[in-house]
């Protein structure tokens, strides 16, 4: 009752290995690392056969098939390149994930290299079987900003792509009778979130109650250059409108808000986020130069009353920008304390502008980002949001523009966006 001699499969072995097999002897067929036992088109780790009473084996010897990790999972905002010829996906094959540069960067500077493991899964040394994450790059416009002009009031036209984080926020409050329409600016922080001033998104009520406008009434335009031609821009509706819970209409303290977009926007040369600063109560240092862009008033001779009465007729068609120095806090406080009216400059604000006037942000620029270039990280960082100004017309002598100090709100912003700061390292100024 001896069974025929057994030949182990290619890339496999049989155990125990004996010269002769008799009735009731059993053998276990297994494969080398990176191969699987294949029997009747079913993959398994091992296969057992037995020598029968009539001197035959209970089954044919199975084959060993190389493990196949199959097509790797797609990476959002990423690409896959095959290191192995013929785009092989079998054991020990290698692939490399990369992000769509220059708009996305891999989290934690991961290599992106994955190897097909013996278990049939793509494995990375650090992330294991998890896919890498492509985060939006921030603060790096595709078109480099010009050497800052010495001297939006006193501003100049922005070339497309200079301020890829710039958002136009249009609010059409159809719940009001009659309907109410206004606009402001904002700054893209990620593919889904816009940073702006709370007063832009507060319902324009007849009392001082702070109530956000309904999300249905908010439209955000990104990649926009000329407001007369919105065809090339990305427009998005809002999924959420979040005002800072302590926003105070009486002194505009905590004038900061976020809009979550209904769908993430595709990033590109004209749509890229700006970086958030480090959490630092001091904010930007006095005399540092920053840039602000907006579609607000660009005529220095227009008074506030004329602006209000003429609706949107005094807007700039093309995005304007201006370069302004940060003003020492004490100097700004003094300049406002000398005016009639309640003009308190709090520690959550900073001022920017020139003593002699002529260059300023104005109505309609509200919520736009005051950005400063960080030499260390070589990125543009949003240090301020256009908040308020004096009673005189924009660009008046010794009337500085007042900005929300974004560095005081970094934790609040991350919290609202639902991202721990460690996960978004590239977004933080280094």
């Amino acid at each position: 009752n001896e069974c025929p001699e057994l030949q182990p499969p290619v890339h496999g072995k049989i155990e125990p290995s004996q010269a002769k097999y008799f009735f009731k002897d059993q053998v276990l067929v297994s494969c080398d690392t990176g191969y699987k036992v294949l029997k009747d088109n079913v993959e398994m780790d091992t296969f057992q056969i037995e020598c029968l009473k009539d001197g035959t084996w209970s089954n044919k010897i199975p084959t060993c098939k190389i493990v196949d990790c199959r097509a790797p999972g797609e990476l959002e905002h990423g690409l896959i390149t095959f290191s192995t010829r013929n785009n092989l996906t079998t054991y020990k094959s290698e692939i490399k994930y990369s992000c769509q540069e220059p708009y996305y960067k891999m989290l934690n500077n991961n290599t992106g290299i994955y190897t097909c493991s013996a278990q049939g899964v793509w494995m990375n040394k650090v992330l294991g079987r998890s896919l890498p994450t492509c985060l939006p790059e921030c603060g790096q416009p595709s078109r480099s900003l010009p050497s800052l002009v010495k001297r939006i009031i006193g501003g100049r036209n922005a070339e497309p792509g200079l301020f890829p984080w710039q958002a136009l926020i249009v609010v059409e409050d159809t719940s009001r009778v009659p309907n109410d329409k206004w606009f402001g600016s904002g700054a893209l922080l990620s593919a889904s979130w816009i940073l702006t001033a709370a007063h832009v998104l507060r319902s324009q009520r007849r009392d001082t109650t702070v109530i956000p406008v309904s999300k249905e009434h908010v439209t955000v335009y990104l990649g926009l250059h000329d407001v007369r031609d919105k065809s090339g821009a990305v427009n998005s509706s809002a999924a959420r409108v979040v005002l800072h819970p302590d926003f105070n209409i009486q002194n505009y303290n905590h004038d900061i808000a976020l809009v979550q977009l209904q769908e993430p926007v595709p990033l590109g040369p004209h749509v890229m986020p700006v970086c958030l600063p480090r959490l630092e109560p001091e904010g930007p240092a006095p005399h540092m130069l920053g840039l602000v862009a907006g579609w607000g008033i660009s005529n220095p001779n227009v008074t506030v009353d004329e602006i209000i009465s003429s609706g949107t007729r005094t807007l700039s068609d093309v995005l304007q920008y201006v370069k302004l120095p940060v003003v020492p806090h004490a100097e700004c406080k003094t300049s406002y304390e000398s005016r009639s009216g309640n003009y308190s400059v709090t520690e959550n604000m900073f001022c920017a502008g020139y003593y002699e006037g002529g260059k300023d942000t104005c109505l309609g620029d509200s919520g736009g980002a005051f950005v400063i270039f960080d030499d260390l990280s070589q990125r543009w960082v949003v240090q301020g949001l256009v908040s308020w100004g004096g009673p005189e017309e924009c660009g008046s002598k010794q009337v500085y523009g007042v900005y929300t100090k974004v560095s005081n709100y970094v934790d609040w912003v991350w919290e609202q966006m639902g991202l721990p700061q460690s996960v978004v390292e590239p977004q933080v100024e280094r």
């Epitope: 009778v177 007849r206 001082t208 209409i249």
Partner: antibody, heavy 114, light 112 residues
Framework: QVQLKQSGPELVKPGASVKLSCKAS????????INWVKQRPGQGLEWIGW????????KYNEKFTDKATLTVDVSSSTAYMELHSLTSEDSAVYFC???????WGQGTLVTVSS | DIVMTQSPSSLAVSAGERVTMSCKSS????????????LSWYQQKPGQSPKLLIY???TRESGVPDRFTGSGSGTDFTLTISSVQAEDLAVYYC????????FGGGTKLEIK
């Protein structure tokens, strides 16, 4: 068109409670607050309180915090005001207003008498 | 609490005359940031519900005749009716909305 329709007159006994209603139509109920105002016979207007249907937030005139309770039923676009522990001082016409006072109800006369 | 004081408490004028009535608040109703005064004017005709005429001190509610004008800033406000009509017989109230809401005592306008 926008309308605020208030419930009919009420004759109630001292110490009792009464619940007045204000049904809104013709506008976005949840996006606009409802105010309640009291006017005693031959007297001026007195603000009682405010309710915002979208999130249910409420503000009261301190004088009325123990006297009035404001609620809304968003499904029927109706605002309610319940007045407690009624006395003759509560005999008045009560108005509701909406869309920041652009529209007013016709008023509900509450008479407190034994 | 903000106290609103209206004067005079009543006045009688002939049709076609110009009339002004005053409203003073115990504190400023101007918010410099919004450049708005949070004061409204209402008209209440006999046996009717109040009607909003003016908000933000000087903005006329839609449908209100242009003979009604609101002016003033800070603590002193005025409602002017440029040419009084018989149908303007009413009590006029001012109301602050700077901090919650407070109505003034009212000015009763009678037609001679």
């Amino acid at each position: 068109q926008v309308q605020l329709k208030q419930s009919g007159p009420e004759l109630v006994k001292p110490g009792a409670s009464v619940k007045l209603s204000c049904k809104a139509s013709g506008y976005t109920f949840t996006s606009n607050d409802i105010n309640w105002v009291k006017q005693r016979p031959g007297q001026g207007l007195e603000w009682i309180g405010w309710i915002y249907p979208r999130d249910g937030s409420i503000k009261y005139n301190e004088k009325f915090t123990d006297k009035a309770t404001l609620t809304v039923d968003v499904s029927s676009s109706t605002a309610y005001m319940e007045l407690h522990s009624l006395t003759s001082e509560d005999s008045a016409v009560y108005f509701c207003s909406g869309v920041e006072d652009s529209y007013w109800g016709q008023g509900t006369l509450v008479t407190v008498s034994s | 609490d903000i106290v609103m004081t209206q004067s005079p408490s009543s006045l009688a004028v002939s049709a076609g005359e110009r009339v002004t009535m005053s409203c003073k608040s115990s504190q400023s109703l101007l918010i410099s940031r919004t450049r708005k005064n949070y004061l409204s004017w209402y008209q209440q005709k006999p046996g009717q519900s109040p009607k909003l005429l003016i908000y933000w001190a000087s903005t006329r509610e839609s449908g209100v005749p242009d003979r009604f004008t609101g002016s003033g800033s800070g603590t002193d406000f005025t409602l002017t009716i440029s040419s009084v009509q018989a149908e303007d017989l009413a009590v006029y109230y001012c109301k602050q909305s700077y901090n919650l809401y407070t109505f003034g005592g009212g000015t009763k306008l009678e037609i001679k």
